[in-house]
């Protein structure tokens, strides 16, 4: 028996052109929460298969609100440890799957909406007892950044935790060959000789005469550290005077591996984790056919005319996904509107659509001009989910009913008196004073300050602007 | 006005790889899904899938997965398709086209692709 | 896959006639029935979408109606600009799938 721990560092954009926009925003603020499944051995099931090692969900991380404008950043994290405990031998080897999921915290019919932002998985060999393994794995725009292990819990000990610790049988020390049971120092481990001279910190062993070496170790004895050990960043020179490794240019760096693999770091390389239907060291090879049912969901598999697509899955409606592994989320399609909230709801697609906005779409303005007569000669102008009319000379008010006082602003200059006309208005000039608004004073010599005059027309000529 | 601008002709030979974009301008770039239509020379026209122009997120239909790619440059308001490993079946006219909820309203003017050895 | 069948590939029609288009599909889409016209340069355009929603834009001459499985495209006066292939295109379910084209030529 033992627990496997997952320890997430940082959830975020990935690097290169189109990062993701944050999954939060103002309007809808949301945390993130993390769920792990774990599978025995190297094959890769259906993420909908159950989870025969265990599985776990974190807590909700902090709840998170996009900055207006600024690119998504590492989202907050949830506290703590994601722990899966399993009952039997830890097999060495396994699948896993780790789920982003978005809770969104806005007003949601029924609380709170939950939906799938990002989901990775990888097959890896891992010892029980050993360090931190860290890795780094890519979903469409997203980068999860990981560390794991697998501790066995007391009395197991071992690499699968399948040995057992027993109580010491002298007070002192444990008999030859044999270990403590850190951390039960009071206990040893059942009898088992290891090859005399393996290192007791470094070095295990499962069958008597053997040495086998925790991961950093190297050597007959497991004494001889490899260059890359005991730091949880295994990379660039070692420090002088710490011996830990400074973080420098690691192997995953530019991921080697092709065909969307993902690339974790081995304590001499790297290793690529493929997707279904390649292989190799850089996953370059194409190798899974339809014989392997690669197909979830019920898709149906079509072998590929070339070994490029050497099998292509159709997927029933519901699905996507090269394998059919993904749920489609038509809110994905983004249907709805004027900021509009998407619920995918199975058999219909649905838009709530905030206040003003109405439609299936929610591409209907309430307060535009639809349906809305501005009266005597006026015109409906949009604008910012409002209308408004503009209304023909001499009528005002919200629909042009009223009918306005056309000399109410005082309009005429220089102590001209207005009247109000079928057309407008009228200005009666005062002496020395002339314009459709008495705004030109004629001067004394017979000139006046008026523009130039219309052809035809001489400046001080008699006229009436209206 | 709301305009999408794709890229010139390409001439390529088979197994090369061609990235295809798509500009767009007038309106709010992630508001709207991207998506691209292919049409082969003297056929219809055949929706490839689309990309979720606020997640990056994109969706194949299944004739169309494996050697196609749909990516985003936000900043840019650009939509990409990369087709790697050419075949001469490739050889088509493509069509970037925004979502609007209903249908795809407007269009790009097309990206001529010929693979040729 | 839902199929979109349009049944006429190709139609002659003289100036100031009226046309109508067809397009049937394999089940039910519920009114999420979309046309679009490609000019012979290449350029393509929506005309209607949801069955009957004239495409800001497009002349009040084109209409659209049909429920279920059964929908079509009206022109109510040809013009010369009219000159085009019509699609069809269902947008009710994944993967969205495209009517074969009818041709439209004067006569």
């Known amino acids: 028996a033992g627990v496997f721990e997952l320890q997430i560092h940082s959830f975020g954009p990935g690097p290169g052109p189109g990062a993701p926009r944050s999954p939060c925003s103002a309007r809808l603020p949301c945390r993130l929460f993390f769920r792990v499944c774990l599978k025995p051995g190297l094959s890769e099931e259906a993420a909908e298969s159950p989870c025969a090692l265990g599985a776990a969900l974190s807590a909700r991380g902090p709840v998170y609100t996009e900055q207006p404008g600024a690119p998504a950043p590492d989202l907050p994290l949830p506290d703590g440890l994601l722990q899966v405990p399993f009952r039997d031998a830890w097999p060495g080897t396994f699948s896993f799957i780790i789920e982003t999921w978005r809770e969104e915290l806005g007003d949601q019919i029924g609380g709170p909406a939950w939906s799938l932002l990002a989901r990775v998985a990888g097959r890896r060999r891992l010892a029980a007892g050993g360090p931190w393994a860290r890795d780094i794995q890519r979903a469409g725009a997203w980068e999860l950044r990981f560390s794991y292990r697998a501790r066995c819990e007391p009395p197991a000990v071992g690499t699968a935790c399948t040995r057992l610790c027993r109580p010491r049988s002298a007070p002192s020390r444990c008999g030859p060959g044999l270990r403590p049971c850190a951390p039960l120092e009071d206990e040893c481990e059942a009898p088992l000789v290891c090859r005399a001279g393996c290192s007791p910190e470094h070095g295990f062993c499962e069958q008597p005469g053997e040495c086998r070496c925790l991961e950093g170790w190297t050597g007959p004895l497991c004494t001889v550290p490899v260059s890359t050990s005991s730091c949880l960043s295994p990379r660039g020179p070692s420090s002088a005077t710490t011996g830990c490794l400074v973080p420098g240019p690691g192997p995953c760096d530019g991921n080697p591996c092709a065909n969307g693999g993902s690339c974790s770091e081995t304590p001499r390389s790297f290793e690529c984790t493929c997707p279904r239907g390649f292989y190799g060291l850089r996953c370059e090879v194409s190798g899974v056919t339809c014989a392997d049912g690669p197909c979830f969901n019920g898709g149906l598999c079509v072998g590929g005319a070339d070994p490029d697509s050497a099998y292509i899955c159709h997927c029933p409606p519901g699905f996507q996904g090269s394998n059919c592994e993904k749920r489609v989320d038509r809110c994905s399609l983004q249907p709805c509107r004027n900021g509009g909230l998407c619920l995918d709801l199975g058999h219909a697609l649905r838009c709530r659509c905030r206040a003003g906005f109405a439609g299936p779409r929610c591409e209907h303005d309430l307060d535009d001009c639809a349906g809305r007569a501005c009266a005597n000669g006026g015109t409906c102008v949009e604008g910012g989910g409002a209308h408004r009319c503009s209304c023909a000379l001499g009528f005002g008010g919200r629909d042009c009913r009223e009918r306005a006082d056309p000399c109410a602003a005082r309009p005429c200059a220089h102590g001209g008196r207005c009247y109000a006309h079928f057309s407008g208005l009228v200005c009666a000039c005062a002496p020395g004073y002339m314009g459709a608004r008495c705004e030109f004073p004629v001067h004394p010599d017979g000139a006046s300050a008026l523009p130039a005059a219309p052809p035809g027309l001489r400046p001080g000529d008699p006229q009436r602007y209206l | 006005q709301i305009q999408l601008v794709q890229s010139g002709p390409e001439l390529k030979k088979p197994g090369e790889t061609v990235k295809i974009s798509c500009k767009a301008s007038g309106y709010t770039f992630t508001d709207y899904s991207m998506h691209w239509v292919k049409q082969a020379p003297g056929k219809g026209l055949k929706w490839m899938g689309w990309i979720n122009t606020e997640t990056g997120e994109p969706g194949y239909a299944d004739d169309f997965k494996g050697r196609f790619a749909f990516s985003l440059e936000t900043s840019a308001s650009t939509a990409y398709l990369q087709i790697n490993n050419l075949k001469n079946e490739d050889t088509a006219t493509y069509f970037c086209?925004?979502?609007?909820?209903?249908?795809?309203?407007?269009w790009g003017q097309g990206t001529s692709v010929t693979v040729s050895s | 896959d839902i199929q979109m069948t349009q049944t006429t590939s190709s139609l002659s029609a003289s100036l100031g006639d009226r046309v109508t288009i067809s397009c049937r599909a394999s089940?039910?889409?519920?009114?999420?029935l979309n046309w679009y016209q490609q000019k012979p340069d290449g350029t393509v355009k929506l005309l209607i979408y949801?069955?009957?929603r004239l495409h800001s834009g497009v002349p009040s001459r084109f209409s659209g109606s049909g429920s279920g499985t059964d929908y079509s495209l009206t022109i109510s006066n040809l013009e010369l600009e009219d000159i085009a292939t019509y699609f069809c295109q269902q947008g009710d379910m994944l993967p969205w799938t495209f009517g074969g084209g009818t041709k439209l030529e004067i006569k």
């Open positions: 949801y069955t009957s």
């Open positions: 089940q039910d889409i519920s009114n999420y």
């Open positions: 086209a925004r979502y609007d909820g209903y249908a795809m309203d407007y």
